[in-house]
Interface confidence: medium
């Protein structure tokens, strides 16, 4: 089974080779390249200086070769590289190059989404309801959930509204929101609102956005 | 001695395809690249892409994407480029050269000349 | 794309004189970490197959006159053919194997 690596968007995947190098073998004595699931390559150290008239355009100077640990670091990392990589070795021997070492890994991009941001779209409607809408914007991948907590002196409710996703066509990146009419009919006191946001991984919680809720006017002095 | 010896001159029609070929000797076919470059008439060297033959992998010149189809033979050490759609500006010399980090020994070249 | 630009297009010197090319190089050529440039020049004569003189932008390709050297680094370097005789009439090309392939539109070099 490959190696799994997760790594984040804009910076750096190690990608390992772990190759044991048994017989102390010198890298000028081999040619060490890595691929992708589209046979592109990355990167090739042939006879122990890189070489670049077969890297792919998408890789090119994005890459560096750790000759003590046999790692290619990819840098500036995007979602679109996610996906299987090979790392290869050939001995160069006077009959030809002989395969003597493949380490498959694969890599998964992720982004963290910005903390959950509420904003209000309209105001308290005679104490009814309130019309908002909770965003997060540049994860990856999607989220799971994301939902509205409404938080009063007695009680805590919440909401799950349907999910809006955005993902950007160049970056592949996704922008989400929800939009919510929050009711409180029955409530006097106030209320704090909180949006969370839940990932494979994560639970981001918005700042909160509080409600101050005015207290009934008594009725007027009866006067006889 | 490293040799790469070029197919011969070819007349073709607009329109039709070209298969150069590049036989290796010398040396171990699989230890290298073979790149492809062809010259204009009159004009400078212009690079087509490479083929690294230990590993299968193709590159090219973005230029001559769809145009030239690079591919070997590993069993007669010969590699091959194969122009389609031809026409009269793709009138050159076509060179094969052994390469790793530069061009060391180069075939002698194989005119193709397109003409209605 | 990487592009080399050669000057001057074309260049006549006497027999036994010095000729000097120039080829820049619109970004760097230089490998910080192996320290290379990844630069060759090469000979071409008339109805002949270019010839490699020199790679990594100052070693000499075995067989090469030593009145043939290279020099610079980054994005300038220059061959220089230090008493020019007969036979080093050709067209000289630059090439960067930075990245993918490239190579500069050639020298002409002639006899004054």
């Known amino acids: 089974a490959p190696l799994k690596i997760q790594a984040y968007f804009n910076e750096t995947a190690d990608l390992p080779c772990q190759f044991a190098n048994s017989q102390n073998q010198s890298l000028s004595e081999l040619v060490v390249f890595w691929q992708d699931q589209e046979n592109l390559v990355l990167n090739e150290v042939y006879l122990g200086k890189e070489k670049f008239d077969s890297v792919h355009s998408k890789y090119m100077g994005r890459t560096s070769f750790d000759s003590d640990s046999w790692t290619l670091r990819l840098h500036n990392l995007q979602i679109k590289d996610k996906g299987l990589y090979q790392c290869i070795i050939h001995h160069k021997k006077p009959t030809g190059m002989i395969r003597i070492h493949q380490m498959n890994s694969e890599l998964s991009v992720l982004a963290n989404f910005s903390q959950p941001e509420i904003v209000p779209i309209s105001n308290i409607t005679e104490n009814v309801y309130i019309n908002l809408t909770c965003s997060s914007i540049h994860g990856y991948p999607e989220p799971k959930k994301m939902s509205v907590l409404l938080r009063t002196k007695n009680s805590t409710i919440e909401y799950d509204g349907v999910m809006q996703k955005s993902q950007d066509n160049v970056t592949e990146l996704y922008d989400v929101s929800i939009s919510l009419s929050v009711s409180f009919p029955d409530v006097t006191s106030n209320m704090t609102i909180f949006c969370i946001l839940e990932t494979d991984k994560t639970r981001l919680l918005s700042s909160p956005f509080s409600i101050e809720l005015e207290d009934p006017q008594p009725p007027p002095d009866h006067i006889p | 001695q490293v040799q790469l010896v070029q197919s011969g001159a070819e007349v073709k029609k607009p329109g039709s395809s070209v298969k150069v070929s590049c036989k290796a000797s010398g040396y171990t076919f699989t230890d290298y690249a073979i790149q492809w470059v062809r010259q204009a008439p009159g004009q400078g060297l212009e690079w087509i892409g490479v083929?690294?033959?230990?590993?299968?992998?193709?590159n090219y010149n973005q230029k001559f994407k769809g145009k030239a189809t690079m591919t070997v033979d590993k069993s007669t050490s010969t590699a091959y480029m194969e122009l389609s759609s031809l026409r009269s500006e793709d009138t050159a010399v076509y060179y094969c050269a052994r390469a790793a980090w530069y061009m060391d020994y180069w075939g002698q070249g194989t005119l193709v000349t397109v003409s209605s | 794309d990487i592009v080399l630009t050669q000057s001057p297009d074309s260049l006549a010197v006497s027999l036994g004189e010095r000729a000097t090319i120039s080829c820049k190089s619109s970004?760097?050529?230089?490998?910080?970490?192996?320290?290379?440039?990844?630069l060759a020049w090469y000979q071409q004569k008339p109805g002949q197959p270019p010839k490699l003189l020199i790679y990594w932008a100052s070693t000499r390709e075995s067989g090469v006159p030593d009145r043939f050297s290279g020099s610079g680094s980054g994005t300038d370097f220059t061959l220089t053919i230090s008493s020019l005789q007969a036979e080093d009439v050709a067209v000289y090309y630059c090439?960067?194997?930075?990245?993918?392939?490239?190579f500069g539109q050639g020298t002409k070099v002639e006899i004054k």
């Open positions: 970004q760097s050529l230089l490998n910080s970490r192996t320290r290379e440039n990844y």
């Open positions: 090439s960067q194997s930075y990245n993918l392939y490239t």
């Open positions: 083929i690294n033959i230990y590993y299968d992998n193709t």
